[in-house]
């Protein structure tokens, strides 16, 4: 889980090692702060849980791409 050491900086210290369907993901944000030990992606799920993930993993990249497309596509 993400950890806010000194708000508003949130860091990830561990990544999930389980693949999660993009259909459980609502949004994401990238963690690139130099105050954090590693770059990370924090996914927010449909039930508002936050998950730290490794941006180097393919499923994480694919999920970010999917969420990007989803927000670009206007709902009919």
């Amino acid at each position: 889980q993400p950890d806010a050491i000194n708000a508003p900086v949130t860091c990830c210290y561990n990544f999930t090692n389980r693949k999660i369907s993009v259909q459980r993901l609502a949004s994401y944000r990238r963690i690139t702060s130099s105050k954090c030990p590693k770059e990370a992606v924090i996914f927010k799920t449909i039930v508002a849980k936050e998950i730290c993930a490794d941006p180097k993993q393919k499923w994480v990249q694919d999920s970010m791409d999917h969420l990007d497309k989803q927000t670009q596509t206007p709902k009919t």
């Epitope: 889980q1 389980r18 459980r24 449909i46 998950i51």
Partner: antibody
């Protein structure tokens, strides 16, 4: 393709514990989210718990909290479900179940392990 | 917890006739942002583990005959077998996967009349 093979049937006395195993092949355990579902004779399906990537930990149905422990051995790609303080109502078929990407539903199931609790 | 209620408990249908099973959730399992219903249907035959039939409320799993269809949204869902075959005799369960604890309906037993 994921395959799940469970350990054999068990007969236990009331008050005892049982440990059921589920061996994964075709995938490594760390790529999956393994769960356990049980079914008493002639009854419906009941989710017991499993590893929830959204919580980052194993979670249990409230009914079984304190009596069930689910563990993983990543070196052998095997998961275990241990149920303690057994009573006759725990007589059931116990299934492990998973899906390659965690969604919350299951498209791969073990063959089931029958646990009979009888004095 | 989301409570899943199935009806009827059992159903006897003539071969070639339509079978309809209902499933109601105590709260919505629709996530409006992606317009997906987090509901699945399983078929279970005696002595076998459940088999996935329908996911996202209406998408047939590959290899499942097209006589099986799922419909509904929000809290009310239906599994329809358009023309019952002998091999469809089984118990059918709905399950919500919107949130944990994961919960199943009580099951509907489908038999031949």
């Amino acid at each position: 393709q994921v395959q799940l093979v469970q350990s054999g049937a068990e007969v236990k006395k009331p008050g005892a514990s049982v440990k059921v195993s589920c061996k994964v092949s075709g995938y490594t355990l760390t790529e999956l989210s393994m769960h356990w579902v049980r079914q008493a004779p002639g009854k419906g399906l009941e989710w017991m718990g499993g590893f929830d990537p959204e919580d980052g930990e194993t979670i249990y149905a409230q009914k079984f909290q304190g009596r069930v422990t689910m563990t993983e051995d990543t070196s052998t790609d095997t998961v275990y479900m241990e149920l303690s303080s057994l009573r006759s109502e725990d007589t059931a078929m116990y299934y492990c179940a998973t899906r390659e990407f965690w969604t919350g539903y299951f498209d791969h199931w073990g063959q089931g392990t029958l646990v009979t609790v009888s004095s | 917890d989301i409570v899943m209620t199935q009806s009827p408990d059992s159903l006897a249908v003539s071969l070639g006739e339509r079978a309809t099973i209902n499933c109601k959730s105590s709260q919505s399992v629709l996530y409006s942002s992606n317009n997906k219903n987090y509901l699945v249907w399983y078929q279970q035959k005696p002595g076998q583990p459940p088999k996935l039939l329908i996911y996202w409320a209406s998408i047939r799993e590959s290899g499942v005959p097209d006589r099986f269809s799922g419909s509904g949204s929000g809290t009310d869902f239906t599994l329809t077998i358009s023309s019952l075959q002998a091999e469809d005799v089984a118990v059918y369960y709905c399950q919500q996967y919107y949130s944990t604890p994961l919960t199943f309906g009580g099951g509907t037993k489908v038999e031949i009349k």
